[in-house]
């Protein structure tokens, strides 16, 4: 059965997933899909790294973590109910059927009704005053110049402080980690 | 293996729009990466345009954000550069680059050199 | 922006020499930093990335070091295949680039 992992709605949801590289920098291919793990690959493809880097990507969807040292966990930004669901981490590991494949159920519940707003800090995963917004076709990147200058240096550090520090306790429990090589 | 070669005139003049195709080898633009615009001026330095995700999102060089806009032709695995309002500091050998989600790049085209002047 | 300054613009070395070329970022950047050799007339090659995890297919006598504001790229032993002119390159925020490195023969 899956592990469970919660977050509220419009905060980063945190979905823990680690593996040992045999040496430092030499990744192996990991994938994050939407839906249990199938067979092969990852199923709705959220997020994809190979060798080298993350080579696939979608909104809200980034690795927080040191990916070169194995830390793949996934942060979902800014999260809605229709992020709930079981999600894919898929270590490639090279041979055949050699995958490690971890199903993650997330549920997300609403937001508590709060007296009085509390100050949010944003930020935006892209470049400086880069903000990606959707719509029905292609993503399109708009400039806006009253965002604040945040780096992807410090997009880690606000990611390591919005991170449910809970969460990091169920993951060691859960044994969502294997050691390749 | 993948390949980028660009193509486009070689010439244009002041005030004019100057458009570059890059067209990709060996790999859909769609499966993923971000497909980035870099030019090298006749002193050698480098500057980073832009780029079109393998999603269509953008992200464009703020002191060029006014100026560029960079598209894909997916039926033809192509993405393109248009850079408004040139001057003849714009002249500059072009190259089109394939790059990670943190744009560096591995893959480079040999580079198309534009010169603008009247 | 963040600024990149590279240093020294250009040296002269011998083959067999081992070579050091810094480069200094004017903010934080974390280790995302990438290096390029580029020769003339040809598109620049991918080094480094990451700081210090070699491309695949770069010899191991090119290594690179650093995080924070100070990198460094090195060549163990200069062969003649390597006089070139090497950039530095940051992508922490919006990527920039160093002046580069030309490395002549002595």
């Known amino acids: 059965s899956e592990v469970e992992y919660r977050a509220e709605v419009g905060q980063n949801a945190y979905l823990p997933c680690f593996y040992t590289p045999a040496a430092p920098g030499n990744l192996v291919p990991v994938c994050w899909g939407k839906g249990a793990c199938p067979v092969f690959e990852c199923g709705n493809v959220v997020l994809r790294t190979d060798e080298r880097d993350v080579n696939y990507w979608t909104s809200r969807y980034w690795l927080n973590g040191d990916f070169r040292k194995g830390d793949v966990s996934l942060t979902i930004e800014n999260v809605t109910l229709a992020d709930s669901g079981i999600y894919c981490c898929r270590i490639q590991i090279p041979g055949i059927m050699n995958d490690e494949k971890f199903n993650l159920k997330l549920v997300i519940k609403p937001a508590k009704v709060t007296p009085a707003p509390t100050r949010q800090r944003d930020f935006t995963a892209a470049f400086p005053r880069m903000l990606t917004t959707r719509g029905h076709g292609p993503a399109e990147t708009q400039t806006l110049g009253s965002l604040p200058d945040i780096n992807l240096t410090q997009i880690s550090t606000l990611a390591n402080e919005l991170r449910d520090s809970r969460l990091a306790n169920d993951l060691r429990d859960s044994g969502a980690t294997i050691r390749i090589g | 293996q993948v390949q980028l070669q660009e193509s486009g005139p070689g010439l244009v003049k002041p005030s004019q729009t100057l458009s570059l195709t890059c067209t990709v080898s060996?790999?859909?633009?769609?499966?993923?990466?971000?497909w980035n615009w870099i030019r090298q001026f006749p002193g050698n330095g480098l500057e980073w345009m832009g780029y079109?995700?393998?999603?269509?999102?953008?992200s464009y060089n703020p002191s060029l954000k006014s100026r560029v806009t960079i598209s894909v032709d997916t039926s033809k695995n192509q993405f393109s550069l248009k850079l408004s309002s040139v001057t003849a500091a714009d002249t500059a050998v072009y190259y089109c680059?394939?790059?990670?989600?943190?744009?560096?790049?591995?893959?480079w085209g040999q580079g198309t050199t534009v010169t603008v002047s009247s | 922006d963040i600024q990149m300054t590279q240093s020294p613009s250009s040296l002269s070395a011998s083959v067999g020499d081992r070579v050091t070329i810094t480069c200094k970022a004017s903010?934080?950047?974390?280790?995302?930093v990438a290096w390029y050799q580029q020769k003339p007339g040809k598109a620049p090659k991918s080094l480094i990335y990451?700081?210090?995890y070699r491309y695949s297919g770069v010899p191991s006598r090119f290594s690179g070091s650093g995080s924070g504001t100070d990198f460094t790229l090195t060549i163990s032993s200069l062969q003649p295949e390597d006089f070139a002119t090497y950039y530095c390159?940051?992508?922490?925020?919006?990527?920039?680039f160093g002046g580069g490195t030309k490395v002549e023969i002595k």
């Open positions: 680059a394939r790059g990670y989600r943190s744009p560096w790049f591995a893959y």
């Open positions: 079109i995700s393998h999603s269509g999102s953008t």
């Open positions: 390159q940051q992508y922490n925020s919006y990527p920039t």
């Open positions: 990451s700081a210090s």
């Open positions: 903010q934080n950047v974390g280790a995302n």
């Open positions: 060996g790999y859909s633009i769609t499966s993923g990466f971000a």
